[in-house]
Interface confidence: low
């Protein structure tokens, strides 16, 4: 009932709590002398369902039969209406519509760890929409029954606070949960289990790993478990992998040897436990142990390449380059590279350790036969040396690959193709494709890139260190024994018209013709490989079309003669540059007047 109901009563039959689909009778009756003062027969009783009128009646009482009430709570209020006054609230009632509880399903109990307590969970079934109380019973040895009630609105979990112990691991326990509300009750099917069935071990802890003699091949994983654990499963993976290796072990007693770990790799290890071969459940996985395996001496061999540069008649500069070993080959942190340079006939050798670089430059005599060996060293040893005889890589003209082309292949890739050399193609042992950013002046500090290609290949896709709008000098070497031939080409992955034209820095007169000199366009403004320069000129005050001279681009060229100017005429000259994508804007304009005699 709601409020004080001083003026009358509302009664509900058969009950304030009804089963969904039931009918209720609601009666509103005024107490004596609580009607309208002057005209009691004018009493108008009105029944509201929430805020909506559903019935009214003149007199001292009102009866209403109500059906079709929804699940949940519905509020009915009875009011009195008298002439010339507001409605007065008489009384009200809440009706609770629900269902009897369904049978709880899937009752299961667990004890987390040998020192834990028994807790049970179940599925309640559909909502009853009524206050429902759950009672959990646990019966066991010595005719004991434990019982615990749960008064949460949505109760599907209870912890007994009982610690089952393994004194009699085969003793049976029976759990049952009963749900009760105003409309009925229902009990789950009983769940019978033993200690071994429900104790879920705590995950192993204090996980450690030991490498005997700092060797990855002698590795033991140690952990601590609860006393009754019989089975363990181990899973481990490199930290950068998603796939686990799994191992099942019985009676491990907190240790297991791992034989297949890779050196110098960070691994993640986890362990789970179980008390019985076929009873009970696995523990959660332990916390992860992350540990790095020890180094082993490197395997594999370095990929080494070199460049030769003529210095003078007696000396040459050798630049060696090598690629880092892969992680799986390095098998540790590479501390240094050992480079040995040897003159083969005289036997003189010099060895140097290089740290922090993957290149080395030295100057050697142009005479003699030279060889180098390069190896990588970590804390455990060195890789097998890569040996290379220094030769003139482009000396054998007949070994030069033919018809070399370089074409853009998608974003930041260049496809290099070639034809085998004229000389017996079967003599080729491998091709090397080398590329570096084109820098006027042939800067030897520019990083060198290369890849090796099998002798039957006639193309290679280069993508490493390729940037858009940069021109690359690409060489294809054919190697055969201690001979090599090469061909070169310029290529870019993406190009557009240069951003500026060359800057004319001088015009000089020589025997009736002129020599124009210019500064190269800055590399970042070339926007790809330059194909041509154009020199334009016209008479200073003329509106005629300029004349032009187109010069094929050569890296080292920065001057060109023109001999078609008339003497004593002032000309305006300028230059542009072209890539395959188009022509640049004008460079600077220079005026010049040829002083020579007229023909």
């Amino acid at each position: 009932k709601i409020d004080a109901c001083k003026r009358g009563d509302v009664t509900v039959k058969p009950s304030h709590v009804i089963l969904l689909g039931s009918t209720v009778n609601i009666t509103c009756s005024l107490k004596p002398r609580q009607g309208c003062f002057h005209y009691s027969r004018r009493n108008k009783l009105i029944l509201y369902k929430f805020d909506r009128r559903i019935n009214f009646h003149h007199g001292h009482s009102l009866n209403s039969q109500v059906t079709g009430l929804p699940l949940g709570t519905t509020l009915f209020v009875c009011k009195l209406a008298c002439i010339n006054s507001d409605e007065i609230q008489i009384c009200g009632a809440e009706i609770f519509v629900g269902v009897a509880p369904e049978q709880p399903q899937n009752l299961s109990c667990i004890q987390k760890g040998e020192q834990g307590t028994v807790a049970c969970t179940w599925e309640r079934g559909r909502d009853t929409h009524l206050y429902t109380e759950y009672t959990l019973q646990l019966s066991g040895p010595k005719n004991l029954t434990w019982q615990k009630q749960c008064k949460d609105i949505y109760c599907d979990y209870l912890d007994f606070g009982i610690n089952l112990t393994p004194e009699s691991p085969e003793s049976n326990f029976t759990a049952k949960v009963t749900a009760v509300n105003s409309l009925g009750s229902s009990s789950s099917l009983p769940s019978t289990f033993t200690f071994l069935d429900i104790v879920r071990p705590l995950p192993p802890w204090d996980i450690r790993i030991k490498f005997q003699k700092a060797s990855v091949s002698r590795c033991t994983l140690y952990w601590r478990d609860e006393g009754l654990v019989l089975l363990n499963r181990l899973r481990y993976r490199p930290s950068n992998s998603r796939l686990w290796n799994m191992v099942n072990v019985t009676k491990a007693k907190g240790r297991h040897d791992l034989l297949d770990l890779k050196p110098f790799t960070e691994y993640e290890f986890q362990i789970s436990s179980k008390l019985h071969l076929y009873k009970g459940s696995w523990s959660d996985w332990s916390e992860s142990l992350r540990a790095q395996t020890p180094e082993e001496e490197p395997t594999g061999m370095l990929d080494v390449w070199y460049m030769k540069r003529h210095i003078d008649y007696s000396r040459q500069q050798i630049s060696l380059f090598w690629k880092n070993l892969s992680v799986s080959e390095a098998r540790g942190k590479i501390l240094h590279y050992q480079v040995t340079l040897q003159e083969l006939t005289g036997g003189k050798a010099m060895t140097q350790n290089i740290t922090g670089h993957t290149s080395w430059t030295t100057v050697i005599p142009r005479t003699g036969n030279w060889a180098v060996a390069v190896s990588a060293a970590n804390s455990k040893g060195s890789s097998l040396p890569t040996r290379i005889n220094i030769m003139n890589l482009c000396e054998a003209g007949l070994l030069a690959p033919r018809q070399v082309s370089a074409n853009s292949e998608g974003m930041d890739n260049i496809l290099v193709t070639w034809q085998p050399p004229r000389k017996d193609p079967s003599a080729v042992q491998e091709y090397v494709v080398e590329w570096r950013e084109l820098h006027p002046g042939g800067d030897t500090q520019v990083p060198l890139n290369w890849l090796r290609s099998r002798p039957y290949n006639v193309s290679a896709l280069i993508s490493e260190n390729i940037k858009s709008y940069i021109c690359y000098e690409i060489r294809v070497y054919a190697l055969s024994g201690d001979q090599g031939g090469c061909s070169s080409i310029l290529g870019n992955s993406k190009h557009k018209a240069p951003l500026s034209g060359p800057h004319i820095n001088a015009i000089t007169e020589e025997k009736g013709s002129i020599l124009i000199s210019w500064n190269s366009i800055p590399v970042q403004e070339q926007m790809g490989c330059l194909l041509h320069y154009r020199i334009y000129w016209k008479e200073r005050d003329s509106n005629s079309q300029p004349q032009l001279c187109e010069i094929p681009y050569r890296v080292s060229q920065n001057s060109h003669p023109i001999n078609s100017l008339q003497p004593r005429v002032t000309y305006v000259l300028w230059m542009t540059a072209l890539t395959a994508a188009g022509e640049s804007s004008h460079g600077n304009e220079r005026e010049f007047c040829l002083q020579g005699k007229a023909n």
């Epitope: 802890w205 332990s286 916390e287 142990l289 992350r290 540990a291 790095q292």
Partner: nanobody
Framework: QVQLQESGGGLVQAGDSLRLSCAAS????????VGWFRQAPGKEREFVSA????????IRDDSLRGRFTISRDNAKNTVYLLMNSLKPEDTAVYYC??????????????????????WGQGTQVTVSS
Amino acid sequence: QVQLQESGGGLVQAGDSLRLSCAASGRTFDTYIVGWFRQAPGKEREFVSALSWSDDTTIRDDSLRGRFTISRDNAKNTVYLLMNSLKPEDTAVYYCAAKAKPPAATWSSYRNREWYDYWGQGTQVTVSS
């Protein structure tokens, strides 16, 4: 051998901030785990936060709801604990602890006070309401 010296404690009002310092002498922190713990009167020493110097890993107790931040200054060989929105229940002696970083550690090692080898004398923090 590492000697640890905490400083920066004192009496503050609830809601204030404080920065504690832990300076090492004897050797640098670069191969150490450095942890902050606190011990309120009559209670056990509890973990607050920790930092692994070499790989910049930090570990914190989330019950502090992000109010405390651990940081470091390489040049000064010092670890700091910045404490914001202080509450009276933060009143405690705050200790700095250190351990040489092992090749492998389990997830909860850093929280375990028995795990640390070196301890400072502590600095008192009192938060008044």
